[in-house]
């Protein structure tokens, strides 16, 4: 498992010291108190493809 300070979490996730693993930033909208959510502010969500030009 990844240790803090080594390779970054995948896009859209952030390291949780409380879980010792990367956690999904998408959950921070519903529960912003999670320890990894501060890291999500600097990590933009995964890109999405526009459905129109």
């Amino acid at each position: 498992e990844q240790a803090p300070g080594t390779a970054p979490c995948s896009r859209g996730s952030s390291w949780s010291a409380d879980l010792d693993k990367c956690a999904d930033c998408a959950s921070c909208r519903a529960r912003p108190h999670s320890d990894f959510c501060l890291g999500c502010a600097a990590a933009p969500p995964a890109p999405f493809r526009l459905l129109w030009p």
């Epitope: 010792d20 956690a23 519903a30 320890d35």
Partner: antibody
């Protein structure tokens, strides 16, 4: 079968110390967060402390902060709670519980508890 | 800390009855709400997590609903083994998780 077995409870005088243990079996201990929850006689449940899978992150209820220390030994599949400066209001059954594999979501397995009585 | 208030504190019911227990949070907790059953002298047992998901091995007569501040645990047809105390627990405001005060279900 998942089992959690607490030990170390007993009668202690105010200001004294105790160390509780929780031996885990029937599952791989190291990936799971663990918690201590207590229940005073005839009362409801109160969360006490949390520890991350590696032991690197810990959290405490305000009522025990600075007096209790949670730790774990993954090589021994054991969770600990060091309790210092005990008070009468710490009298309770202490349960260890396994956290879910997502963030603080639930306690899916519990031990049977160990009784701590703080009295002179 | 978020306060969790259960009602009623106790209730009397008969085998076969439909029983409803409510839990209200002092602020919105989304769906971060769990229900436990505790029998005298025993450890609590997880029944429902994430407000409405049934824990593995729990009978389907138990169900949970709600989101935001108001939640319900329903036992569709009370069985003799269901007489116990039930607790709700919020896991929204981490790490300061809190439990309700409990609802004791007694035999009428």
């Amino acid at each position: 079968e998942v089992q959690l077995l607490e030990s170390g409870g007993g009668l202690v005088q105010p200001g004294g110390s105790l160390r509780l243990s929780c031996a885990a079996s029937g599952f791989t201990f190291s990936p799971y967060p663990m918690m201590w929850v207590r229940q005073a006689p005839g009362k409801g449940l109160e969360w006490v402390s949390y520890i991350s899978p590696s032991g690197g992150s810990t959290h405490y209820a305000d009522s025990v902060k600075g007096r209790f220390t949670i730790s774990r030994d993954n090589s021994k599949n054991t969770l600990y709670l060091q309790m210092n400066s005990l008070r009468a209001e710490d009298t309770a059954v202490y349960y260890c519980a396994r956290g879910g594999d997502t963030y603080f979501d639930y306690f899916d397995y519990w031990g049977q508890g160990t009784l701590v009585t703080v009295s002179s | 800390d978020i306060q969790m208030t259960q009602s009623p504190s106790s209730l009397s019911a008969s085998v076969g009855d439909r029983v409803t227990i409510t839990c209200r949070a002092s602020q919105s907790i989304s769906s971060y709400l769990n229900w436990y059953q505790q029998k005298p002298g025993k450890a609590p047992k997880l029944l429902i997590y994430a407000a409405s998901s049934l824990q593995s091995g729990v009978p389907s007569r138990f169900s949970g609903s709600g989101s935001g501040t108001d939640f319900t645990l329903t036992i569709s047809s009370l069985q003799p083994e269901d007489f116990a105390t039930y607790y709700c627990q919020q896991s929204y405001s981490t790490p300061g998780i809190t439990f309700g005060q409990g609802t004791k279900v007694e035999i009428k």
